[in-house]
Interface confidence: medium
């Protein structure tokens, strides 16, 4: 500790007094000492606070399990070692930069993970994608891209790692808008989704969401991604079918000014364009499970 | 792409009876829902009855208990059986077919064949 003396001045009350020297190392003490607490706690926080949520709770067991469990269910699918699946998912964003992602380092997964669905059976989705899937589900010959490997593995999580350590960020990952694009997620979406569009052939089936203000939303992954990366020359037709979300809603939202938009840019691109409304989504379904029902040839 | 032609059309007396045909060809290896459809002059195009792949079956309130219809899937064909004829009966009748929307949404089905003239004079 500093030297303290004592010395008595008016009145009988001690008083502590430091010598220049003491002072000016007890500053410089304290200065280390906040220094030391920025560096350790502060630093580290701010390198890493990003806008969006973190890499999901048990992320790297999560992808190992789903790819094992999607490799028992598809014959096709099981010559997939999933050790090496996570290790080359890992690989594509471990100790990067986590808003430098290219789709280049999803390559080694593209590859392993390459898969044969047919070309005519797919169905594609916009901000609808629950539906999309209870469709798929029941209609077990049609695919969106989450019934692929790939998209099995991802689907609702989120993932990113921190530049030059081998950790991952399980407090915060980057915002696509507040951050930056090229982060590991949104990166990983647009490599398979672009994959899966260039694949499709024939008639081409999307649904979107009726009740949203934009029904077809140029930003969304089908807007920016998928509707770009149909090949004309394999792909006959887009159809769009629009899910109403109102029972009492039997406009033509066909008629929609986003959907005469996506008219446009698929016929643009020598692409035929249908569309139809999807009035009764419930009904849908079901009829679909059960197209016996008498029920099923009134108006859905 | 799937073509439909229908056939059977013509001309009739006031409750007499008629067979419309339709046949499918092109690509029918999916379970296509069919139906039929009549647009009467000056008149919007409305449901008639429809079939599903498997059997099941639906008829507009007006024709109940008089029209028929069914289907033979070998023959990829679709067949509605006119009984007790009216007047108001007469239209052109257009067989239609869908993949998934299971009719009767007359914008939004995906086949449609060119039609035939029902007359029925009283």
């Known amino acids: 500790m500093a030297n303290c003396e004592f010395s008595p001045v008016s009145g009988d009350k001690p008083c502590c007094r430091l010598s220049r020297r003491a002072q000016l190392c007890l500053g410089v003490s304290i200065l280390v000492l906040i220094l030391v607490v920025v560096l350790a706690v502060v630093v580290p926080r701010w390198r890493q606070q990003w806008s969006g949520p973190g890499t999901t709770k048990r992320f790297p067991e999560t992808v190992l399990a789903r790819c094992v469990k999607y490799t028992e269910i598809h014959p096709e699918m099981r010559h997939v070692d999933c050790q090496s699946v996570w290790d080359a998912f890992k690989g594509a964003f471990i100790s990067k930069h986590p808003c430098n992602i290219t789709e280049e380092d999803y390559q080694p997964l593209m590859k392993l993970g390459t898969q044969t669905v047919p070309c005519n059976k797919i169905l594609l989705w916009s901000r609808i994608k629950d539906l999309a899937h209870q469709f798929t589900q029941v209609q077990r010959d049609m695919f969106t891209l989450e019934d692929t490997l790939l998209g099995y593995l991802a689907d609702d999580l989120t993932w990113c790692g921190e530049f030059n350590t081998s950790k991952i960020n399980y407090q915060s990952c980057p915002d696509w808008r507040k951050d930056c694009s090229n982060n590991p997620v949104s990166v990983f979406w647009k490599t398979v989704s672009r994959r899966f569009a260039e694949a499709a052939c024939d008639v081409v089936h999307v649904m979107l969401n009726g009740s949203r203000s934009k029904i077809f939303d140029k930003n969304s992954t089908f807007g920016s991604v998928e509707v770009h990366n149909l090949q004309p020359e394999k792909v006959q037709t887009l159809e769009a079918w629009v899910i109403h979300g109102g029972r009492e809603d039997s406009r033509d939202l066909c008629q929609d000014p986003t959907i005469k938009e996506l008219e446009s840019i698929i016929s643009k691109r020598n692409i035929q364009f249908s569309c139809k409304n999807i009035y009764r989504p419930d009904k849908f379904l079901q009829c679909v499970k059960n197209p016996e029902d008498s029920s099923c040839t009134s108006e859905i | 792409q799937v073509q439909l032609q229908e056939s059977g059309g013509g001309l009739v007396q006031a409750g007499g009876s008629l067979r419309l045909s339709c046949a499918a060809s092109g690509r029918t290896d999916t379970r296509y829902t069919m139906g039929w459809f009549r647009q009467a002059p000056g008149k919007e195009r409305e449901f008639v009855s429809g079939?599903?792949?498997?059997?099941?079956?639906s008829y507009a309130d007006s024709v109940k208990g008089r029209f028929t219809i069914s289907r033979d899937n070998g023959k990829n064909s679709v067949y509605l059986q006119m009984n007790s004829l009216k007047p108001e009966d007469t239209a052109v009748y257009y067989c239609?077919?869908?993949?998934?929307?299971?009719?009767?949404?007359?914008?939004?089905?995906?086949?449609w064949g060119q039609g035939t003239q029902v007359t029925v004079s009283s």
């Open positions: 239609a077919a869908d993949r998934f929307t299971l009719v009767p949404t007359t914008s939004d089905l995906d086949y």
């Open positions: 079939i599903t792949w498997n059997g099941g079956t």
